[in-house]
């Protein structure tokens, strides 16, 4: 693989455009944050492949690692993955954003870790601090990765100065998960509450008689202490519980609540954390998308599913053509809304042995006192195609006609075919397709009608045969998205005194 320019580190101007190329003997691809950004493929006469990454209107957020790999990387040799690091110094971007999981660093042993606070400019001086302290910690910094070292279980922030303003990173929480004889569990009555509602958390320790609980929570950091209550669960020996209760929650109470438990005899400790979100008001949000047109097959069962998030628990109603639906006593419709997690719901409408009359406009509405959401779609009932009639007649004009009539939903296509050699066809000889060809032998006339009440299409097709000089097997095939049906008739010449 050859990367141009080779790097391994580039510093680019904000708002400019920059072009990178990567070439190799097989198709190559650029990757950024485990995804493939828009790029363009080109090829040389000697068979070399290249991928061109055009970075336009660069911002600090384009800072980071870029990799070029073979499109079908099978081996893991070093030459099969080239790394390039790009800086775009941008005074409007302080620290590069982190995913939530990067802010929590968990350890099971004493080992070197990296606090991944990164800036857009390699010239900036970056320092590391404990969240509550001003003293810079003596830890080496790599502008491409962050601070690497051995850290205690604390909260850390990075600081830098851009121009004349000091910028702080998000807080990074280092947790050393020690294998310990103390086993702590933390749970909340609710992890999402509205402002004004109560937050109640419980921290339970099993198997110890004397322990010390210490809670850390957002209010504590602003000096507003809450006194926890400790009790013993009498029906369970050595189960000790600490309850942290915050009445009338405020938005600032959102954050991480940590229960740290220590026992002094063996100097064991353990801690667990839980995130609490305080929202201004309740919400209902759809997750994923449901197409505006849904299909069901006649006489089959069909479940239509809507996934959404809500707090507080909502009321869910389903409507068909603006009329409220309920579970039918005949078992034709089943409605269910399941709570799959604290704030996530799945609502399902099941139509059992679908009937044509169940086509129509469906709406699901989820609501509570603070918010509502609704989702609508059209349900089309697909009916497998069937040939209802295939008949042959001899009008006075001398020609012979074959009429084929059938129905289905969606609209069926009609295919006419014929076989002249009755002994060998269709096993040995494929049938010949018939239609409005340039030949005078056959002519086709097809009419389509939509039957509103039955909600299906009817196709009537008439095939006119000019000269039938020997018995002819004529086949009418109707086909649609959910099936096909065929009927066959044998057409004999006028002159023959019998029909098979």
């Amino acid at each position: 693989l050859v990367v141009t320019p080779p790097g391994p580190e580039l510093v680019l101007n904000v708002s400019s455009t920059f072009v990178l190329t990567c070439s190799g003997s097989a198709p190559v691809v650029w990757e950024r944050m485990s995804q493939e950004p828009p790029q363009e493929m080109a090829k040389a006469q000697d068979g070399t492949f290249s991928s061109v990454l055009t970075l336009t209107n660069l911002t600090g957020l384009d800072t980071g690692e870029y990799f070029c790999t073979h499109n079908d990387s099978r081996g893991l040799e070093t030459d099969e993955r080239k790394r390039l690091y790009i800086f775009v110094p941008d005074p409007t971007v302080g620290f590069l954003p982190n995913d939530a999981e990067e802010l929590f660093i968990f350890l099971t042993e004493i080992t070197e870790i990296t606090i991944p606070c990164r800036v857009t400019d390699p010239q900036l001086v970056v320092t590391l601090h404990e969240k509550k302290g001003d003293v810079a910690l003596p830890v080496p910094y790599d502008h491409q990765r962050g601070f690497s070292g051995i850290f205690e279980d604390r909260s850390y922030i990075c600081k830098t100065t851009i121009g004349d303003r000091e910028v702080d990173s998000d807080a990074y929480y280092v947790y050393r998960l020690q294998v310990s004889s103390i086993n702590v569990s933390v749970n909340a009555v609710q992890t999402v509450v509205r402002q004004g509602e109560n937050i109640t958390l419980m921290c339970i320790v099993i198997g110890n008689e004397v322990v010390n609980f210490e809670w850390t929570y957002p209010r504590k950091e602003s000096g507003r202490l809450v006194e926890p209550v400790t009790d013993f669960l009498l029906d369970m020996p050595y189960h000790i519980r600490s309850i942290l209760h915050i009445p009338s929650a405020e938005l600032e109470d959102s954050g991480t609540y940590t229960c740290n438990v220590t026992e002094s005899v063996n100097d064991h400790q353990d801690e667990k954390a839980i995130n609490i979100t305080v929202v201004e008001s309740g919400y209902v949000r759809l997750l994923g998308e449901v197409g505006t047109l849904q299909f069901a097959e006649l006489h089959r069962s069909r479940t239509l599913q809507v996934v959404f998030e809500a707090y507080p628990p909502p009321t869910v109603l389903w409507f068909k053509d603006n009329r409220t639906l309920g579970d039918s006593s005949a078992g034709e419709i089943a409605l269910s809304t399941r709570n799959v997690s604290e704030t996530r719901y799945v609502s399902e409408l099941t139509l059992v042995r679908v009937k044509v009359a169940e086509a129509g406009h469906y709406t699901m509405r989820a609501f509570h006192e603070d918010a509502e959401v609704q989702l609508s779609f059209q349900l089309q009932i697909n009916v497998p195609v069937r040939v209802l009639e295939l008949s042959e007649s001899h009008p006075d004009s001398g020609e012979q006609t074959v009429r084929c009539r059938g129905r289905g939903m969606p609209q069926p296509n009609i295919i006419w075919s014929a076989c002249r050699d009755l002994k060998r066809c269709p096993r040995e000889l494929p049938p010949t397709l018939l239609g409005n060809s340039s030949e005078e032998e056959s002519q086709l006339e097809t009419n389509v009608t939509y039957w509103e009440e039955e909600q299906e299409f009817e196709v009537v097709s008439t095939l006119r045969l000019q000269h039938v000089d020997r018995p002819l097997s004529v086949r009418c095939t109707l086909r649609n998205a959910v099936g096909q049906d065929t009927q066959e008739v044998i057409v004999v010449p006028h002159s023959l005194p019998f029909k098979v």
Epitope: T4, P5, S16, T21, S23, T48
Partner: nanobody, 113 residues
Framework: EVQLVESGGGLAQAGGSLRLSCVAS????????MAWYRQAPGKQRELVAH??????YYVASVEGRFTISRANAKDTWYLQMNSLKPEDTGVYYC????????WSQGTQVTVSS
């Protein structure tokens, strides 16, 4: 700061030819090659060809019809376009590989059928 000036565009018949030139000034010696792009009306700018380390690369739609080259003067690049098609119509831009720069005005190519 790199300055780019494209020329040679114009009106051509389908099947005809045009040769586009790109004259670059500034610290162009630092570039690792040159790319040609085009932008058809109402569409996104797209790569046409590029030359890197002396090797020329072409996108599938122009392969065998277009040729990218560099003049002996070192600061000039060409795009020879043969067997032109109406879908080759657009504004053509050159852009250096491996240099922070800004797009220039480009040169308009119109191919009539």
């Amino acid at each position: 700061e790199v300055q780019l000036v494209e020329s040679g565009g114009g009106l051509a018949q389908a099947g005809g030819s045009l040769r586009l030139s790109c004259v670059a000034s500034g610290n162009i010696d630092s570039a690792n090659g040159m790319a040609w792009y085009r932008q058809a009306p109402g569409k996104q700018r797209e790569l046409v060809a590029h030359i890197t380390s002396g090797t020329s690369y072409y996108v599938a739609s122009v392969e065998g019809r277009f040729t990218i080259s560099r003049a002996n003067a070192k600061d000039t690049w060409y795009l020879q376009m043969n067997s032109l098609k109406p879908e080759d119509t657009g504004v053509y831009y050159c852009f250096p590989i491996g240099l922070s720069a800004h797009w220039s005005q480009g040169t308009q190519v119109t191919v009539s059928s």
